[in-house]
């Protein structure tokens, strides 16, 4: 019962994770105009991994793609790879882990198949959860190190008589959503990595028996089962945790005055 | 069609406060910001302040202690009170309608305040 | 607070002739997110609310005649009339949208000679 409430809340904790790294990835929000100690403007900037919006007190709000994949900077390419990395693998583990749940039985699916689409599954939602953790905090590097470069020429000076208005940005709301989602999918692995555990077909453990052969003992005990990631058969007693390959696989347009979001 | 009209007392005396109405018509307030701008006769323009979408408001850092622009949107209406006015205040009112740029595309015809004891 | 310059204070012009006002800010009007110049242009005829021209410093308003043109960046602007009509007799205003207050130029009269 607690193996399947373990694996059932994992589950649930990794879909909701997984949920917040596709809505942290889609929002606008990754870097917001900063407003503190700065001249109060008509108009807020904030930037997200796809386009850029502006929003003019008037409550027109004008965003603009990036158009260019080749002029973007390689951080943000990254950040994206990672993001997109984070949700391919987590909806494949979300996949798996519908069928591996212990309350859904599916023709004669034993538990040790189960128990290795749980690891499967667990694992997956762990490397997903840190690339989105990775993309988040690879962008928030970003931003601090362009905040200070910002605040070191805030204003700067045209003929010593003319002021420009340095536009600085910090944290936006994606970051954060990022920064928890990416975590709860990683506790959700976590949880199902435990949940495979528990998962194992029972099997009938003796003690420790001594076996006395002429000519020299051989103390056997038979260890207990270890799940391996494939969805084949098991061998019994392997003890290998194969956690498997992971890969990174992975237009400027001005508006008119009725394109507006 | 769009309309603005401003309303209110003509006369004020000094060291009252003065309060103007805005009432529109042929668009909402959820979706359009408004601002106030006056102009003392034979002057140029001086904006006051606006009220946006959601109720937050913005005003002049000169007027800013006196100055409390409200609405209401059922009423499709926008106060502007000016509290301690003075014979400098005498000017024409203006509301208008903030759009794209943060300009103001429509004007209301403006009410003549002049503060006078 | 950014103070607006206009110049001439006064324009005389013949019909038909091209008519320039200048507009200069004391801070740039120039926003890095989307590269666009928060200056407005209006027009204000004796008797009458101001009307909006050009905002975003060179986007004509719907309505407005093509021979109004706006154009500039940072902390100057420009707005020109191509062709002199009777009808744009007025007092010409331009507007900082950028940074609060949203103070107004002094306006510069244009007048027909």
């Known amino acids: 019962m607690a193996v399947t409430a373990c694996q059932g809340l994992g589950f649930v904790v990794s879909l909701i994770g997984i949920a917040g790294i596709i809505a942290a990835t889609c929002m606008d929000q990754w870097s917001t105009q900063d407003l503190y100690n700065n001249p109060v403007t008509a108009v807020f900037n904030y930037q997200g991994l796809w386009r850029s919006c502006v929003r003019e007190s008037s409550g027109f709000t004008e965003c603009r793609g990036y158009f260019t994949l080749l002029g973007l900077p390689a951080m943000l390419q990254a950040v994206r790879a990672l993001m997109i990395v984070g949700i391919v693998l987590g909806a494949i583990g979300l996949l798996v882990s519908i069928f591996a749940l212990k309350c859904i039985r599916i023709g004669s699916m034993e538990d040790s198949a189960k128990a290795n689409m749980t690891l499967t599954s667990g694992i997956m939602f762990i490397v997903s959860g840190l690339c989105a953790i990775a993309g988040v905090s690879v962008f928030a590097n970003m931003l601090v190190t362009n905040f200070w470069m910002s605040t070191a020429n805030m204003y700067t000076g045209m003929g010593g008589m003319v002021q420009t208005v340095q536009t600085r940005y910090t944290f936006g709301a994606a970051l954060f959503v990022g920064w928890v989602a990416g975590g709860l999918t990683l506790i959700g692995g976590v949880m199902m990595c435990i949940a495979c555990r528990g998962l194992a077909p029972e099997e009938t453990n003796y003690k420790a028996v001594s076996y006395h052969a002429s000519g020299h003992s051989v103390a056997y005990k038979p260890g207990g089962f270890k799940a391996s990631t494939g969805f084949g058969s098991n061998t019994k007693n392997k003890k290998i945790y194969d956690g498997g390959a992971r890969t990174e696989d992975e237009v400027q347009s001005y508006p008119s005055k009725h394109d507006y979001v | 069609q769009v309309q603005l009209q401003e309303s209110g007392p003509g006369l004020v005396k000094p060291s009252e406060t003065l309060s103007l109405t805005c009432t529109v018509s042929g668009f909402s307030l959820t979706s359009y910001a408004i601002s106030w701008v006056r102009q003392p006769p034979g002057k140029g323009l001086e904006w006051i302040g606006e009220i946006w979408t959601g109720g937050g408001t913005n005003y002049n850092s000169s007027l800013k202690s006196r100055v409390t622009i409200s609405k209401d949107n059922s009423k499709s209406q926008v106060s502007l009170k000016l509290s301690s006015v003075q014979a400098a205040d005498t000017a024409r009112y203006y509301c208008?309608?903030?759009?794209?740029?943060?300009?103001?595309?429509?004007w209301g015809q403006g009410t003549l305040v002049t503060v006078s004891s | 607070d950014i103070v607006m310059t206009q110049s001439p204070d006064s324009l005389t012009v013949s019909l038909g002739e091209r008519a320039t006002i200048n507009c200069k800010s004391s801070q740039s009007l120039l926003n890095s997110g989307n590269q666009k110049n928060y200056l407005t242009w209006y027009q204000q005829k004796p008797g009458q609310p101001p009307k909006l021209l050009i905002y975003?410093?060179?986007t004509r308003e719907s309505g407005v005649p093509d021979r109004f043109t706006g154009s500039g960046s940072g902390t100057d602007f420009t707005l020109t009339i191509s062709s002199l009509q009777a009808e744009d007799v007025a007092v010409y205003y331009c507007?900082?949208?950028?940074?609060?207050?949203?103070?107004f130029g002094p306006g510069t009269k244009l007048e027909i000679k």
């Open positions: 975003w410093a060179s």
């Open positions: 208008g309608r903030l759009s794209y740029g943060n300009s103001l595309d429509y």
């Open positions: 507007q900082n949208n950028f940074i609060y207050p949203l103070t």
